[in-house]
Interface confidence: medium
């Protein structure tokens, strides 16, 4: 009956319009489909033009939904990465705060003439944190070799102390242990508890970096075409009720997205690996524990040179031979009390155990997120048929959706009846991302282990590597020359959508 | 004895950048930081920048500061100070200084001075 | 910045103290004199009171909180010139140097 078919154009008449899209392209009534590309060819409300339209507008529509589901996962993981970096970096920055309130009075000039020492100690540690290129453990090694010499100084200034004695007390030093065990526990767990930290933190901007990079790949003509089919050929066929096929949905979306969920397994082994980490944030060698108390090993170590002084004196002569006198300098420094110590074990504030169980119940609920993501955008964006089998839109008209729902990831998608894929070209930036997955997730699963893995750059667009020692002012400049025998690689990214707020390295 | 020898002072253009090189002997040039002071003509002493021994930590004084990059080479015990854009007010004589200790940028610690060099902005 | 009195005078013999004020508090001091202008300064006193080898006696260093005394015991005619401190500030950690004070002995 051709007025009832001439009637249905004013429902498309309707939905075009209100895309935006010019009406005087729409016919008043249905005309034969032979030019149709994309739709079958049947009579249809549809001109060429209106075809290429909506299939513009389709394709639009799926990638904004795509960047949407996107954008919540990212938020969540930047929202992640910034409530644990402020979390560590506040640790580190109570600690030094705490040194800089307490230590003045507890061990007087042996601080306020080494201030530097430790304030660039806290830089080192904050650069470490942050992925910088540093060997937490020669920087170790060279902060206590050069405070001990300062130290050394300042407690016998009636010697006369030239370079080579001061080489042969740092030769000496290793088995005098001057220190005590300070520097040896510091070592072992700071190592251990920065690398957590940073690791867990780092895992959260490579996962946010991998969703950003992958949500800007642009879907193919082949993707384009099938859901035109899928969601306005129904409209240009006369039955604009219809509503897609669940099944129907499901085959098209998972051929679009085959490269995406080839991302399933090392997403699901990277957010294990990060889950798994947190472990490592609990107990005497746990993040808190240690990267909140590094002032008390620094006073431990303080004290403990004091208390060894007559000792050390006396090994250290034995070792290197009498020191001339110095005729200019006073008497040997008195010895001082010793410095009260905070105790070592922070009481957890509780902060950290409500941040690590939100962070491993969001990761556990976005493991199959790619996976997941045909079945989502079919049932929240594409407004899915709920009616029985034979009444939904299966791509050429309306009725039963007889075809298997394809597996997830491109091999599966060699039969796919909906979307032409060709299964011997994977899409590269998605490949480039599934390596990023594998290199974060070896890193985090050797962070578990407790060794300093060499951070390399993990970004294919890096941004300028970490730095910052809280300068209170710009007098300060980031030094990268490192006279250290270590040749490690910056880290380019090493917290992604972090802004650098604490000056540079050096002042 | 400790040597200080500084050289590429001279007269310069105002706008165009100046690179002074410190010489140091007599001494283990990697322990130590190492310090550029200056003086204008009837002026006091001024803080120019400073290194740490190892090279990863400088401090430059507010005059200079985004202008000037101070840097060390332990192989050939020299400390370079380049600065950029030129001023008249940069005009005066600079010093290299050694410190005592091997952190910046304490004016507090230092124990030797060169002899300077001057230099002179003017168009 | 440090503050210092811009001149003192003394008599040969006497004893001259010259102050160096506004630093911080627990940070150190040193001393340097110059005999003339251009000619290189000489450091008389490092972090307080550690005095140069080929630096006579008569000069010594005292801190009380945040100011530095360089007191000159039995003052000579040689001993005429400009003494500066330094010291640091103790938020950026860059040198800081006070104004300089004239030293002319009568």
């Known amino acids: 009956d051709p007025a009832s078919k001439s009637r249905s154009c004013g429902e498309v008449r309707q939905i075009y319009g209100a895309k935006g899209f010019s009406l005087s392209d729409v016919p008043q009534a249905e005309i034969s489909g032979e030019h149709l590309r994309i739709c079958p060819q049947g009579y249809t409300c549809c001109t060429s033009e209106m075809e290429e339209n909506l299939a513009n507008r389709s394709h639009a529509e799926l990638e904004t939904a795509l960047r949407d589901s996107s954008r919540v996962l990212q938020a969540m993981l930047a929202t992640q990465l910034r409530s644990f970096d402020d979390h560590f970096q506040h640790l580190l920055n109570d600690s030094e705060r705490t040194l800089q309130a307490t230590f003045p009075g507890a061990f007087g000039e042996l601080y306020t003439q080494n201030a530097r020492a430790f304030r660039d100690l806290y830089s080192e540690l904050r650069l470490y944190y942050r992925g910088a290129n540093l060997h937490l453990e020669e920087t170790l090694a060279e902060f206590w070799a050069r405070l001990l010499e300062r130290l050394f100084k300042q407690l016998h200034p009636q010697l006369l102390l030239p370079d080579d004695y001061l080489d042969c007390l740092g030769k000496q030093a290793e088995a005098l242990r001057p220190f005590g065990e300070a520097p040896r526990e510091l070592r072992l767990r700071a190592t251990r508890a920065f690398v957590a930290a940073r690791s867990f933190v780092q895992g959260l901007g490579v996962a946010s970096d991998v969703v950003r990079k992958v949500a800007q790949v642009p879907l193919g003509p082949e993707c384009s075409r099938a859901v035109m089919k899928l969601v306005y050929c129904a409209h240009c066929l006369g039955v604009p009720g219809a509503r897609p096929c669940p099944d129907y949905c499901r085959n098209v979306l998972k051929g679009c997205l085959a490269n995406q969920a080839d991302l399933d397994a090392e997403w699901r082994n990277l957010l294990d690996s990060m889950v798994l980490i947190t472990d490592k944030f609990w107990g005497t060698s746990g993040v808190e524990s240690v990267i909140g108390s590094v002032h008390t090993w620094l006073a431990e170590a303080i004290n403990a040179l004091q208390d060894n002084r007559d000792t050390l004196t006396a090994k250290v002569i034995q070792g290197c031979g009498n020191p001339k006198v110095n005729p200019q300098g006073p008497g040997p420094e008195e010895k001082r009390r010793r410095g009260k110590l905070a105790p070592r074990e922070r009481p957890p504030s509780g902060t950290l155990e409500k941040l690590v169980s939100e962070a491993k119940a969001q990761l556990r609920d976005v493991q199959d997120f790619w996976i997941s993501l045909p079945g989502t955008l079919c049932s929240e964006k594409m407004a899915l048929s709920t009616a029985s089998d034979d009444r939904c839109w299966n791509g050429m008209a309306r009725g039963r959706y007889l075809p298997e729902v394809m597996g997830d990831g491109l091999a599966n998608q060699i039969n796919n009846p909906e979307v032409e894929v060709d299964i011997t070209k994977p899409d590269m930036t998605i490949r480039q991302q599934i390596m990023q997955l594998k290199i974060m997730t070896n890193r985090l699963r050797s962070a578990y282990n407790g060794n300093d893995v060499d951070f390399q750059d993990a970004s294919d667009d890096g941004s300028g590597s970490g730095s910052g020692d809280g300068c209170l002012d710009d007098l300060c400049s980031r030094k990268v020359s490192r006279k250290s025998s270590s040749s490690r690689t910056p880290l380019t990214h090493a917290l992604p959508g972090l802004s650098e707020q604490e000056g540079q390295k050096t002042s | 004895a400790v040597t200080l020898d500084e050289s590429g002072g001279g007269l310069q253009t105002p706008g165009r950048a100046l690179s002074l090189v410190c010489k140091a002997s007599?001494?283990?040039?990697?322990?130590?930081?190492m310090y550029w002071v200056r003086q204008a003509p009837g002026k006091g002493l001024e803080f120019v920048a400073g290194?740490?021994?190892?090279?990863?930590?400088?401090g430059y004084g507010s005059a200079v500061k985004g202008r000037a990059t101070i840097s060390r080479d332990s192989g050939q015990s020299t400390v370079r100070l380049q600065l950029n854009n030129l001023r008249a007010e940069d005009t005066g004589n600079y010093y290299c200084a050694k410190s005592v200790s091997p952190y910046c940028c304490d004016a507090a610690d230092i124990d030797a001075w060169g002899h300077g060099t001057e230099v002179i902005v003017s168009s | 910045a440090s503050t210092q009195p811009s001149s003192v005078s003394a008599n040969p013999g006497e004893t001259v103290k010259i102050t160096c004020s506004g630093g911080?508090?627990?940070?150190?001091y040193g001393w340097y004199q110059q005999k003339s202008p251009g000619s290189a300064p000489v450091t008389l006193l490092y972090s307080n009171n550690n005095r140069p080898s080929d630096i006579p006696s008569r000069f010594s260093g005292s801190k009380s909180g945040s100011t530095a005394t360089l007191t000159i015991t039995g003052v000579q005619a040689e001993d005429e010139a400009v003494y500066f401190c330094g010291s640091v500030d103790s938020s950026s950690y860059a040198g800081i140097f006070g104004a300089g004070t004239t030293l002319t002995v009568l």
């Open positions: 911080s508090s627990g940070y150190a």
């Open positions: 290194i740490g021994n190892t090279g990863r930590y400088t």
């Open positions: 007599g001494f283990t040039f990697s322990r130590y930081a």
